[in-house]
């Protein structure tokens, strides 16, 4: 990508943060080995990456979780990468699903999502999971980011 | 990315190599359908990708392994993407974990890691696993790479 | 990437489509949250992404499937990212494998593949799976794409 003022690199990588909130939206922080290239991408309210410029972005998320089939609902653990644009626009971009493990007390599994999407100016992306209490927040296990093409 | 001398494409994709070494660091080779764009990224000692230029890189690894719950330790199989910068300690950038399968003799699983990170000149990235003997080295199963934004 | 005529952005992201065909090659469509940057990358016959320009591409696929150990063959579910270059044989670029779940009626799992590869003009990439009837086609679960560096 060009490094000039007109086309600066735009990229972010944020790190999962345990949260006491009951929301299914994962929380993130600019901590550890995070990336925030400039103010053309920002982490808002610890939950969404928001971009200033319209364009194509490669967006990705990785979620590691620990669950047990007996202690969990029958439905699988699902991680969703979602988009919200100003003007009442909210959509699921990507989802991944993993059935709970039979390991005790719980079995760890990792999910990786990634794809190229067009984002509108001011658009935000965030990650939803079926049960945030099962997410692993140890170093490197759960992260979220994007890069502008 | 620009193709001029100032901003050549920098990318690598290397292929897993079985190793008799007992180290947890995976071994890689420039074989099969590998990529090594130029000498601004190199594979060193068959174990780490080293970059000459500072900048933001999307770094990824994929590890397929075959393990069995009874034959393995209770701890899950963990793959770690690690960074070694000149004059600094090693640090974990990304990790993924999968609990061992109950399938016999072993159950295959694949892990994918990826994220955007700032690398310093001379920085190296490598992949660690809890048990390298469980890694699958068949065509395309286990690979490692990066691209400079 | 530059936005000039010489170096337009080249990227694609296509969405899985259920198919009555018995082929192991997955079918894709330009529907929902798809991306097709321009005619320098095209979806051909609903099964392969074909590029006009030589160069390095980051190619990825995500496949979510639902299978059961008892109802499936003993072999794991394997997803393969394959390359077909004009005048050459097909070759496997990447593979991932997941052992079938013991969950009933089936257990969902997601696979993610991705890597940097040199493509020739007219080269095509496609995704093969061991059992396409097990693939999940719900919103966001299964997708395929690339971006030119």
């Amino acid at each position: 990508m060009q490094k000039g003022d007109q086309n600066p690199q735009i990229a972010a990588h944020v790190i999962s943060e345990a949260s006491s909130k009951t929301t299914s939206v994962l929380q993130w922080a600019e901590k550890g080995y995070y990336t925030m290239s400039n103010n053309l991408v920002t982490l808002e309210n610890g939950k969404q990456l928001t971009v200033k410029r319209q364009g194509l972005y490669y967006i990705y998320a990785q979620v590691t979780f620990c669950s047990n089939r007996e202690a969990s609902s029958q439905a699988p653990f699902i991680a969703s990468l979602c988009l919200k644009s100003p003007g009442r626009f909210e959509r699921i971009l990507l989802r991944a699903a993993n059935t709970h493990s039979s390991a005790k007390p719980c079995g760890q599994q990792s999910i990786h999502l990634g794809g190229v999407f067009e984002l509108q100016p001011g658009a935000s992306v965030f990650v939803n999971v079926t049960d945030p209490s099962q997410v692993s927040h140890g170093t490197g296990f759960t992260s979220f980011g994007l890069l502008k093409l | 990315m620009q193709k001029g001398d100032q901003n050549p494409q920098i990318a690598a994709h290397v292929i897993s190599e079985a190793s008799s070494k007992t180290t947890s660091v995976l071994q890689w080779a420039e074989k099969g359908y590998y990529t090594m764009s130029n000498n601004l990224v190199t594979l060193e000692n068959g174990k780490q990708l080293t970059v000459k230029r500072q900048g933001l890189y999307y770094i990824y690894a994929q590890v397929t392994f075959c393990s069995n719950r009874e034959a393995s330790s209770q701890a899950p199989f963990i793959a770690s993407l690690c960074l070694k910068s000149p004059g600094r300690f090693e640090r974990i950038l990304l990790r993924a974990a999968n609990t061992h399968s109950s399938a016999k003799p072993c159950g295959q699983q694949s892990i994918h890691l990826g994220g955007v990170f700032e690398l310093q000149p001379g920085a190296s990235v490598f992949v660690n696993v809890t048990d390298p003997s469980q890694v699958s080295h068949g065509t395309g199963f286990t690979s490692f790479g990066l691209l400079k934004l | 990437m530059q936005k000039g005529d010489q170096n337009p952005q080249i990227a694609a992201h296509v969405i899985s489509e259920a198919s009555s065909k018995t082929t192991s090659v997955l079918q894709w469509a330009e529907k929902g949250y798809y991306t097709m940057s321009n005619n320098l990358v095209t979806l051909e016959n609903g099964k392969q992404l074909t590029v006009k320009r030589q160069g390095l591409y980051y190619i990825y696929a995500q496949v979510t499937f639902c299978s059961n150990r008892e109802a499936s063959s003993q072999a794991p579910f394997i997803a393969s990212l394959c390359l077909k270059s004009p005048g050459r044989f097909e070759r496997i670029l990447l593979r991932a494998a997941n052992t079938h779940s013991s969950a009933k009626p089936c257990g969902q799992q997601s696979i993610h593949l991705g890597g940097v590869f040199e493509l020739q003009p007219g080269a095509s990439v496609f995704v093969n799976v061991t059992d396409p009837s097990q693939v999940s086609h719900g919103t966001g679960f299964t997708s395929f794409g690339l971006l030119k560096l």
Epitope: T50, R91, Q120, P121, G122 | - | -
Partner: antibody, heavy 115, light 111 residues
Amino acid sequence: EVQLVESGGGLVKPGGSLRLSCAASGFTFSDYAMSWVRQAPGKGLEWVSEISTVHTYTYYSDAVAGRFTISRDNAKNSLYLQMNSLRAEDTAVYYCARDRVLDYWGQGTLVTVSS
Amino acid sequence: DIVMTQSPDSLAVSLGERATINCRASESVEYYDTSLMQWYQQKPGQPPKLLIYAASNLESGVPDRFSGSGSGTDFTLTISSLQAEDVAVYYCQQTKKLPWTFGQGTKVEIK
């Protein structure tokens, strides 16, 4: 009930400045992008500027870029438009509106630029 | 910039009859599965009011005699049975590409 109330309009000489305000109530102000739209006397609608929710990304029409500055104070539920180097063609009723789909509008405040 | 062109500039329709306003964008305003196109109504001396968003979605509280249709570059606002209170100027607007732009407006009157 959602309410948007503009203030700060008036008569100003070319080259002068004005600061418009918009007081918002009846909704969670910080959750919404906000916009300014203007309407010259007897003319149609013209989008002027938009500001995002938290980190205040700002967007402007070419006609006002470099002269006008949009800002917000989420603690005060207020939106602002600082207008500098005003020209006769900036004469209009200025409306503040909510979200990108402009689902609620204020009554407007008249700005007259004349010598 | 995306230029929005409305037709006709003005329209006189009998009470209870159908009124149709067209809006053409100079390029597509499609964003994935949605058309980023809105319609507004402005009565004399009042601010505009949102009628339709995303080309065909009726805003809450708007009578269902109003409807929107179209995709790509061509859009239509229809008033199925014109009422006296519908006398106003109607504007289309795109939010696909900055700067957001409006059509020039269509004045609807009673014949």
